[in-house]
């Protein structure tokens, strides 16, 4: 039969950051190839990564169609050299992925501090809004566009001369904080979705940016 000596995929795993979404699986193929199908709960399966020898498949284009839907992918195993028109009616071995809801499960990418500006004893810190591959009306949406007020940023800031950290939070991409006049401060931000109750509710911290370097601007008033 057309599927003898093929091994079903296993360890199907979703890897997703800011909606860029890859399905990975095992094993590395020996004399077999894979085709991936993905579907929402409608059961209308769409094939991707046809007869690939890779053990990953980029499914971003499918999941960004509706990031609030729940998706399932399945990986079919075929003998190497398989041609679809061979006429075998036997269903090849396949394995299902875990269910995946992008809006709830995509990891938050490491944010970046775009700029900071000091005016007297106030500093305005701006977080760069990351672009995603999610579209609306043929326009790519930013992370803020997609998550709206579900997404907050936490700012950690401290005097360059000490280690005691303070925090501030915003549900926009800007912070306005009070600082001591004449002191240099360092900043790091973290993206957070407070409504999530899982390990992926927070991003990693941004790179640290400190006053007195080119990213910021200081105006004493």
């Amino acid at each position: 039969s057309g599927t003898t000596n093929t091994v079903a995929a296993y360890n199907l795993t979703w890897k997703s950051t800011n909606f860029k979404t890859i399905l990975e699986w095992e094993p590395k193929p020996i004399n077999q190839v894979y085709t991936v199908q993905i579907s929402t709960k409608s059961g209308d399966w769409k094939s991707k990564c046809f007869y690939t020898a890779d053990t990953e498949c980029d499914l971003t284009d499918e999941i960004v169609k509706d990031v609030k839907q729940t998706y399932l992918a399945r990986v079919f195993s075929y003998p190497a050299g398989h041609v679809e028109s061979t006429g075998s009616t036997e269903e090849p071995p396949y394995e299902n992925s875990p269910e995946f809801t992008p809006y709830l499960e995509t990891n938050l990418g490491q944010p970046t501090i775009q700029s900071f500006e000091q005016v007297g004893t106030k500093v305005n810190v701006t977080v760069q809004d990351e672009w995603t591959l999610v579209r609306r009306n043929d326009t790519f949406l930013s992370l803020r566009d997609v998550f709206g007020k579900d997404l907050i940023y936490t700012l950690y800031y401290w005097k360059s001369s000490s280690s005691g950290k303070k925090t501030a939070k915003t549900n926009t991409n800007e912070f306005l904080i009070d600082v001591d006049k004449g002191e240099n401060y360092c900043f790091s931000v973290q993206a957070v979705i407070p409504s999530r109750r899982t390990a992926n509710r927070k991003s990693t911290d941004s790179p640290v940016e400190c006053m007195g370097h080119e990213k910021g601007e200081s105006r004493e008033i």
């Epitope: 079903a8 579907s39 929402t40 709960k41 409608s42 059961g43 209308d44 399966w45 839907q69 729940t70 399932l72 269903e91 394995e95 299902n96 875990p98 269910e99």
Partner: antibody, heavy 118, light 107 residues
Framework: EVQLLESGGGLVQPGGSLRLSCAAS????????MSWVRQAPGKGLEWVSS????????YYTDSVKGRFTISRDNSKNTLYLQMNSLRAEDTAVYYC???????????WGQGTLVTVSS | EIVLTQSPGTLSLSPGERATLSCRAS???????LAWYQQKPGQAPRLLIY???SRATGIPDRFSGSGSGTDFTLTISRLEPEDFAVYYC????????FGGGTKVEIK
């Protein structure tokens, strides 16, 4: 709240036809595969047929292939089962169920009784 | 076709006791593809467990599913009066088939 309401059951003679309907509400109908499951009096559950959200993919248990046709009208939020060439062994309560991916059955109607007898 | 065999056919227990229901498949079923249902007389079935171990929405945590390959188990940690019913397993790895059911009755 998800609600599924079957109708169209009744008494029919062997060889006859019947069309079951299932009116769905409380969810986006086209986003889900749907299924029919039956239960003969005093017996266990038997899957009959499933259909994808678009209606493009249909599946049947061997015993009803060629006799039963599953379909859906997403504009009316309604699932159908056209049953032809009915046999005595088709006598059962027929349940409509919401069926994510066509795999498991997460919401059920209360069922409609089909009796095939002369 | 994968055949599912449930045992025991009938389980006689008292409220507060632990119930262990077995479902055995004629060939290996990926654990992603097994579900459990509860059915009371005159009512439609209700989904309890899918994916062998994931509880459906609104199902109390006294219900748990486990197993892989050909052997699966539904456990009710402490039977409540409303838990006395018939329980069915169902696989969806190859077509859809149900087990014959286990009746949990009051002792």
């Amino acid at each position: 709240e998800v609600q599924l309401l079957e109708s169209g059951g009744g008494l029919v003679q062997p060889g006859g036809s019947l069309r079951l309907s299932c009116a769905a509400s409380g969810f986006t109908f086209s986003n889900y595969a749907m299924s029919w499951v039956r239960q003969a009096p005093g017996k266990g559950l038997e899957w009959v047929s499933s259909i994808s959200g678009s209606g493009d993919y249909t599946y049947y248990t061997d015993s009803v292939k060629g006799r039963f046709t599953i379909s859906r009208d997403n504009s009316k939020n309604t699932l159908y089962l056209q049953m032809n060439s009915l046999r005595a062994e088709d006598t059962a309560v027929y349940y409509c169920a919401r069926s994510p991916w066509g795999y498991y059955l997460d919401s059920w109607g209360q069922g409609t009784l089909v009796t095939v007898s002369s | 076709e994968i055949v599912l065999t449930q045992s025991p056919g009938t389980l006689s227990l008292s409220p507060g006791e632990r119930a262990t229901l077995s479902c055995r498949a004629s060939q290996s079923v990926s654990s992603s593809y097994l579900a459990w249902y509860q059915q009371k007389p005159g009512q439609a079935p209700r989904l309890l467990i899918y994916g062998a171990s994931s509880r459906a929405t609104g199902i109390p945590d006294r219900f748990s599913g486990s197993g892989s390959g050909t052997d699966f188990t539904l456990t009710i940690s402490r039977l409540e009066p409303e838990d006395f019913a018939v329980y069915y397993c169902q696989q969806y790895g190859s077509s859809l088939t149900f087990g014959g059911g286990t009746k949990v009755e009051i002792k």
